[in-house]
Amino acid sequence: AGHLEQPQISSTKTLSKTARLECVVSGITISATSVYWYRERPGEVIQFLVSISYDGTVRKESGIPSGKFEVDRIPETSTSTLTIHNVEKQDIATYYCALWEAQQELGKKIKVFGPGTKLIITDKQLDADVSPKPTIFLPSIAETKLQKAGTYLCLLEKFFPDVIKIHWQEKKSNTILGSQEGNTMKTNDTYMKFSWLTVPEKSLDKEHRCIVRHENNKNGVDQEIIFPPIKTDVITMDPKDNCSKDANDTLLLQLTNTSA
Amino acid sequence: AIELVPEHQTVPVSIGVPATLRCSMKGEAIGNYYINWYRKTQGNTMTFIYREKDIYGPGFKDNFQGDIDIAKNLAVLKILAPSERDEGSYYCACDTLGMGGEYTDKLIFGKGTRVTVEPRSQPHTKPSVFVMKNGTNVACLVKEFYPKDIRINLVSSKKITEFDPAIVISPSGKYNAVKLGKYEDSNSVTCSVQHDNKTVHSTDFEVKTDSTDHVKPKETENTKQPSKSCHKPKAIVHTEKVNMMSLTV
């Protein structure tokens, strides 16, 4: 089955610049299929823009200005690229790549979409580092004692743009765990978001990862925030036990960012 | 020109209670096209649900049922037993792939229908309230409550900033919420919640110790704070973006 990945969840540009949006095709040979590009402007219907067929033929939707969009494909990397020239306010949209999934019977084909790339146009001069800055929260003793479960919370702050994806995994597993999250909130010129994961007591001794995808992550790779295992023997300790210099001291894992 | 028009912009559904989405075609006969349904969830992921000729996306066949009403020129998508995972925007789209003609392989979309999922009506449940802390940051975790109306107070005399709470459906079909804030006196911050004509405190859930009154304003009686845990990390907490870490004991 064909699968589409759009590695950029967002692409931030200033007016009149060129945006290049990538779509990586897997599970099917890119040279043997057509790749389609759609856009969804805020409040408008999703609209077909342009496609490139298996033989390299490019088709544009009528009414799309010529020279605005360019589409190509690179078989070596199994990638299709949509280039948007001279970006302007009306180009603000989410751009999806798509393909008809190769099934034997023509009438049984389905069109699958990539996860989309949001084109953001800004006139702001942003700080050097507008990647998400993490703070971790470990489960409270009260929760682990009373509910035999623990909640990890991953707070991400001071990022721009607002497009961000967060998911959770156990350290040595690729399974995405069921988590919950708040809305992305504006704080001055940047954004913040938090996500939380509640795990049963038996999973508290495992390491968990909060995985964050953002346009401005360092080196363009997903950021992994590691949540250390919680020792269950600590959870069930007598509350009067001293496990640090002072029973009222807090053990804090303070994640602090500095920028060069 | 062909146009696909959803019946509603927003459809609230209750967990487990069947719901029907409708999408009518203007300007053409629906029978001349194949109808598709997609769902866009948080994070913009567009997932294929259904295409005419009884084609369903992975995991959708058991809980969704697509149909065409030729007489009324509309497409129908039934969600048989909605769950919180079914929240999102639903799009109908049409194509003529396999019917011949030019440029038939593009999809023409209608506007989305936003499906919001609510827990089904149930006995009222009092929340559990827990506080989590890191530096000046404080999070109030409010678990498993019903109904949704709630007021979360992070109680402090030295507030730096507070954020609106996130209220979401819990896996068990009730509600969970988190409220975050930053406080100079984070060690003494407690959380109190007003819900269903009662006030519930994070201190109600603390492990009881001998306690004396605090001398700071608006604080709780218990000197033990809920997230003053002695959790010992087995591994260094590391992250791509973090280049300085302090362990405060």
């Epitope: - | 107070n153 109190s192 269903d196 006030t199 201190t203 109600d204 304003p217 709780t220 009686e221 218990n222």
Partner: antibody
């Protein structure tokens, strides 16, 4: 009928101590959070302290922190305010008030008639 | 700390007249505002909560409005028993109930 009756107000010297009581009737005291609010002569109302129904949470205004202690005895249907290190500025009528929650809205629906505390040498 | 101000300090009106009392918060309190009435020698009496909801037993001639920082208490036609001091109170930073300084409605 809901009734709250404060007592214990009197004349006390600066630096002295006093214990106010509030006897309640007409409702299940152990189910309600309670507050003390005061009013200096000719002045407006000032919230003083809060206690939750089971006494797990107690909150105080900045002006009384460290000097006043709120407590309750649910078995005796009584609310108390222990006032130490009294100052002239503590001179006021002290009201106890029941806190009700209307769905999620805290309101002070029921008040006592007040007891007068005068701090003077 | 949120500071509440009320205006005017005193309102001199005759029975049957309309009274409009104003309350302003130093920062937004959303709709977390209540109004109380107090007569000499008596305890305060709750009139309005959530800016516009009448408490039990409060007559329809008394109404509240506003949100954010500006609020109004209106008595459409003053009755003799309405002459009293009126306090507004914010509850957004519960449990700290902050009261305004009060508006005295007196007989002209």
């Amino acid at each position: 009928e809901v009734q709250l009756v404060e007592s214990g107000g009197t004349l006390v010297q600066p630096g002295g101590s006093l214990r106010l009581s509030c006897a309640v009737s007409g409702f299940t005291f152990s189910s309600y959070d309670m507050n003390w609010v005061r009013q200096a002569p000719g002045k407006g109302l000032e919230w003083v302290s809060y206690i939750s129904s089971s006494s797990t949470a107690k909150y105080y205004a900045d002006s009384v922190k460290g000097r006043f202690t709120i407590s309750r005895d649910n078995a005796k249907n009584s609310l108390y305010l222990q006032m130490n290190s009294l100052w002239d500025e503590d001179t006021a009528v002290y009201y106890c008030a029941r806190e009700d929650i209307v769905v999620v809205t805290p309101i002070l629906q029921h008040w006592g008639q007040g007891t007068t505390v005068t701090v003077s040498s | 700390e949120i500071v509440m101000t009320q205006s005017p300090a005193t309102l001199s009106l005759s029975p049957g007249e309309r009274a409009i009392l104003s309350c302003r918060a130093s920062q937004s309190v959303s709709k977390d505002l209540a109004w109380y009435q107090q007569k000499p020698g008596q305890a305060p009496r709750l009139l309005i909560y959530d800016a516009s909801n009448r408490a039990t037993g409060i007559p329809a001639r008394i109404s509240g409005s506003g949100s954010g920082t500006d609020f109004t208490l209106t008595i459409s036609s003053l009755e003799p028993e309405d002459f009293a001091v009126y306090y507004c109170q914010q509850r957004i930073n519960w449990p700290l109930f902050t009261f305004g300084p009060g508006t005295k409605v007196e007989i002209k």
